[in-house]
Structures are given as C-alpha cells and as structure tokens.
Interface confidence: low
C-alpha cells in the first residue's frame, strides 16, 4: 500500500460514529476506518473529537490537537462495545456543544463533521437528526455523512450539507477502506502556500493562495482570504477568484519591512477560519526592482 493522500488543513474535525446494536459485528471496520482517516489529517493546528451514539451520544474524546491524546482516543474507540438504538441526533448535539463552547471562548476555527451510520433512521429520529445537523451548520460546521449497508441516501443528503457531501458505502463495512481517499479529498480544506510569500513593503499585491478544497464551501461567494497581521489585527479580503486548488486574493498593504501576515481562509464569510502555517512577510524593494 502506498502512503496515499494527506490533509494539512488546520480546522476542527468531529467524527460522529454509530455504535448501535446493528454494528456489533462490524465495529472493527469502523474503528480502522476512523484510525486510518484520522492519521491523514496531519496539521499541528488540526483538532479532532470522537463522538459515538446509540441510545445516547457520548463524547469519547474532546476536541484536541494533542497527538498523544488522539492516540489514546483511538485506543478508547477500539474498546467500544456497540449496542442500543440509532439516536444520531444525540451525536450532533455533542458536536454542537463543543462548537458552541469553542466559539464562546473566542476561537473562530472552522468545523468539519464526518458522521457515520449504517441504518435507516425512523421518521422521528430522522427529523431530530436533521434538526441537530442544521444547528451544527448554523454554528459554522460543514457536515459530511458516510452511509454503510442499510442507509437511506435521501435522508443522509438532508442531514449532510448536500448530496455531494454523502459517501455511500454499498458493499458493506469491509468497503469502508475504499472511500478513505475520496472522503479525505472532499473533506480536506488546506492552505499549502502563498505566492508570493514575500511582498514589498507599502505596495499593493495580489496573492495566489495554493491549497485544496476551497470550493467545498456551501456558497463560494462566502469564501474569504484572511490576513492576521503581526498576531494582532485581522484583515479579511474577498478573493478575485475561487478555484478548488487556489484563491486569488488582494493582499493587504503592509507598510513596514518585516511585518508578517498569517494566512487563513474562511468558507462562511468570516464566521470561522481554516488556519495554516503559511506566512507572508514584507521586505524592502528598491525602485525598479
């Protein structure tokens, strides 16, 4: 097996996992799917949470960027004994609680939810799940659903952001491994580089922001480039162009040599941000250079 793709995006990733009785003999497949997917999100700024649901929702691992805690969280996930009903809405409630708390602490980090279930939701449970998923969306989250075996794709398309945000696994749990590449590609929003990364002090510039997933936004008109200058002032700029692998953005005019602007991207008009390690710095440019 080759290394496969990875995601360098800095955001908050929530796994909401079905541990109802119907997955009793398939929990290992779910676990290995999460384990392999989790370790492909490699940004030091990425935080992750594991939530399981059956008759109630449980936060198995609170949001953390600590790789040792994530390792321990995966160990806990492996020990889960499935059983109970499919109260998916309880899982979304646990995610929304954390997103709300993080927002209240002043963190405006983008949230991505990957929810996995194996069964059709009974009418009232579907209503609750859609309602709670909408609440997560209102808090700024992007919602993806993975459906395995006996799922209802129409239901999941309404729980997720759209039909394009649903990953159907029709060949049973063993086929979960086969969607890792596609789910990573679709759920990953990452900033990889800025061109140019050094700009002339006091001059106006356009910056090409290289990355992936910029068109995963529900509405590309809400995509913003954000420049956090010298760890203090943040300036948001509307891009001239939004493509999946790059943004063309006006750079703020940075008057002094040595100023630094950390690059972020918002997919929702500034409600929350994808962070990165990409920095734009200013330098002195002599006339005619």
């Amino acid at each position: 097996e080759d290394g496969g793709p990875a995601c360098y995006g800095g955001f908050d990733l929530y796994f909401i996992l079905d541990k109802s009785g119907s997955v009793l003999h398939h929990w290992n497949e779910i676990y290995y799917f999460v384990e392999q997917l989790a370790h492909r999100f490699i940004s030091p700024q990425l935080r992750m949470s594991f939530i399981v649901f059956s008759t109630r929702g449980t936060t198995l691992m609170k949001l953390t960027e600590d790789r040792e805690q994530i390792r321990q969280g995966l160990e806990e996930l492996q020990k889960v004994l499935p059983g109970g009903d499919t109260y998916m809405h309880e899982g979304f409630e646990r995610a929304s609680e954390q997103i709300y708390y993080e927002n209240s602490q002043g963190y405006r980090t983008a949230s991505v939810i990957i929810a996995l279930t194996d069964g059709e939701l009974h009418e009232d449970l579907f209503f609750y799940s859609e309602r709670e998923a909408n609440r997560s969306r209102d808090l700024g989250a992007i919602v993806y659903c993975v459906g395995v075996k006996d799922f209802n794709e129409t239901q999941l398309a309404r729980i997720a952001d759209s039909k394009d945000h649903v990953f159907p696994v029709n060949d049973g749990f063993q086929a979960l491994q086969g969607i890792i590449h596609s789910i990573l590609k679709k759920s990953c929003i990452e900033i990889l580089a800025a061109e140019p990364s050094t700009i002339c002090a006091g001059e106006s510039f356009q910056v090409v922001v290289r990355g992936n997933g910029f068109r995963h936004a529900r509405n590309v008109d809400r995509v913003l480039c954000s420049f956090k200058i010298n760890d203090s002032v943040t300036l948001n700029e509307k891009p001239f162009a939004v493509e999946d692998t790059y943004l063309l953005c006006p750079a703020p005019i940075l008057k002094e040599v040595g100023m630094k602007a950390a690059l972020q991207v918002s997919m929702n008009d500034g409600l929350s941000f994808i962070s990165s390690s990409v920095i734009i710095t200013t330098t002195h440019c002599s006339d005619g250079s």
Epitope: E1, D2, G3, G4, E35, Q36, H39, R40, I42
Partner: antibody, heavy 126, light 109 residues
Framework: QVQLVQSGGGVVQPGRPLRLSCAAS????????MSWVRQAPGKGLEWVSA????????YYADSVKGRFTISRDNSKNTLYLQMNSLRAEDTAVYYC???????????????????WGQGTTVTVSS | SSELTQDPAVSVALGQTVRITCQGD??????ASWYQQKPGQAPVLVIY???NRPSGIPDRVSGSRSGNTASLTITGAQAEDEADYYC???????????FGGGTELTVLG
C-alpha cells in the same frame, strides 16, 4: 524526560550471537512502534529492523533477514535486537529509535523517528 | 543501493541559505523526515512529516516535498549547523524504512 538507554554492545567473533537492549523511560514503550538503525564506521545510517507497538508486526532489512530478531517486552519497557551469525560487515554503531505516529506499523504513514538511544558499538572481529 | 539519493557534500557561507535535497520514488507516496548528526553523536530529528519541526528545532530550519523530491532548507546558516544530514522515509513497498546516503554540510567563514 523521554529517553532510550542502550546496552549490550561489544566485540564478538564472526558467527557468534549478541543481544542488544534498549530501555525506555518517560513514555510507554507499548504505545509506539520502535526501530533499530545502524551506522558502519565512516558510513551513513542504515535501517535494520522495526516492530509494532504490540510486537505483532516485525520488519527487517534484507541484509539482516533470517539472522536478526527484533522483540520487545512492554512490561519491562525494553526493546531488544538478537543478532545471530554475526559477520564482519555487521560492525557498526547500533541505535534504537522511537517511531513517530501510530503504534501499528501496518499503518500507511511513517513520519520519522523522534527519540534515539545513545548508540552502542558492535565490533565483529576474529 | 539506497532508494533515496542525496548530494554527498554541500557548503554554505555563514548567514546564507542552503538547501539539501533528497530524491526517490518512494517520496511520492510517503513522508520525508530529516536528521542532523554531528560526529560521535546520535542523530537528531529536525523535520518530520515533510515539513514539521519538532520543538527545540529553530525556525530557520524548514522542510518541503514536491513530487519525488524532499528538501531541507536552512536559512541564515550558523556554524553549529555544520553536520551530516540524512533524509528518511518508508520505501516503495511500505514495509521497510530507508535512509538517504547523507549530505555533509560545511559552513564557510
């Protein structure tokens, strides 16, 4: 503090065995995949062997396969390298190292080795 | 023969920028890590996962990967940067680990 302390090196005759030990402190050895790397005098680093956190998966370089055995005793927080049928070309400084990332070495990703032992010299000579 | 190829020696003037490269097909599908080794000492991890610096490594050291080439860049080289540098990744099979042949960095001046 996280560290690896090695022992067991020395001078040994060709064809004879030797066992190297690597004691971990400051972290739970069983949570991490581990590796042995060697460096012949004046040469570069050469990967020798690796083992998963549970000890269930082991891997060897072609140059030592069938002669060397990597093992671990997680209750003692210690990693071992049993070297049999030693040859002159096995003369090197041997390092144990902790592998970054998941303890399951069947995993897709290998990020690097973040903690190294101090090294122990093995000289194979008649 | 090593699956990862490095230039045997590179020199840089004090305070200047130097880039050490590592080539190999395995790098297309795996991460590169970089180690610094000074005479008589154990290697020290300076970059992991292509471009991540462990704590304690100065930010003038950076890493990147493009296609089958990984690069280690030292900006504003200091005398203490003089050492051997090795790249490392999983091999093409994914079951072995492989090191580059090493690059001896000399800081001039």
């Amino acid at each position: 503090q996280v560290q690896l302390v090695q022992s067991g090196g020395g001078v040994v005759q060709p064809g004879r065995p030797l066992r190297l030990s690597c004691a971990a402190s400051g972290f739970n050895l069983g949570s991490y995949a581990m590796s042995w790397v060697r460096q012949a005098p004046g040469k570069g680093l050469e990967w020798v062997s690796a083992i998963s956190g549970s000890g269930g998966s082991t891997y060897y370089a072609d140059s030592v396969k069938g002669r060397f055995t990597i093992s671990r005793d997680n209750s003692k927080n210690t990693l071992y390298l049993q070297m049999n049928s030693l040859r002159a070309e096995d003369t090197a400084v041997y390092y144990c190292a902790k592998i970054l990332g998941p303890g399951n070495l069947n995993y897709y990703y290998y990020y690097g080795m973040d903690v190294w032992g101090q090294g122990t010299t093995v000289t194979v000579s008649s | 023969s090593s699956e990862l190829t490095q230039d045997p020696a590179v020199s840089v003037a004090l305070g200047q920028t130097v880039r050490i490269t590592c080539q190999g097909d395995s790098l297309r599908n795996s991460y590169a890590s970089w180690y610094q080794q000074k005479p008589g000492q154990a290697p020290v991890l300076v970059i992991y996962g292509n471009n991540n610096r462990p704590s304690g490594i100065p930010d003038r050291v950076s890493g990147s990967r493009s296609g089958n080439t990984a690069s280690l860049t030292i900006t504003g080289a200091q005398a203490e940067d003089e050492a051997d540098y090795y790249c490392n990744s999983r091999d093409s099979s994914g079951n072995h680990v492989v090191f580059g042949g090493g690059t001896e960095l000399t800081v001039l001046g």
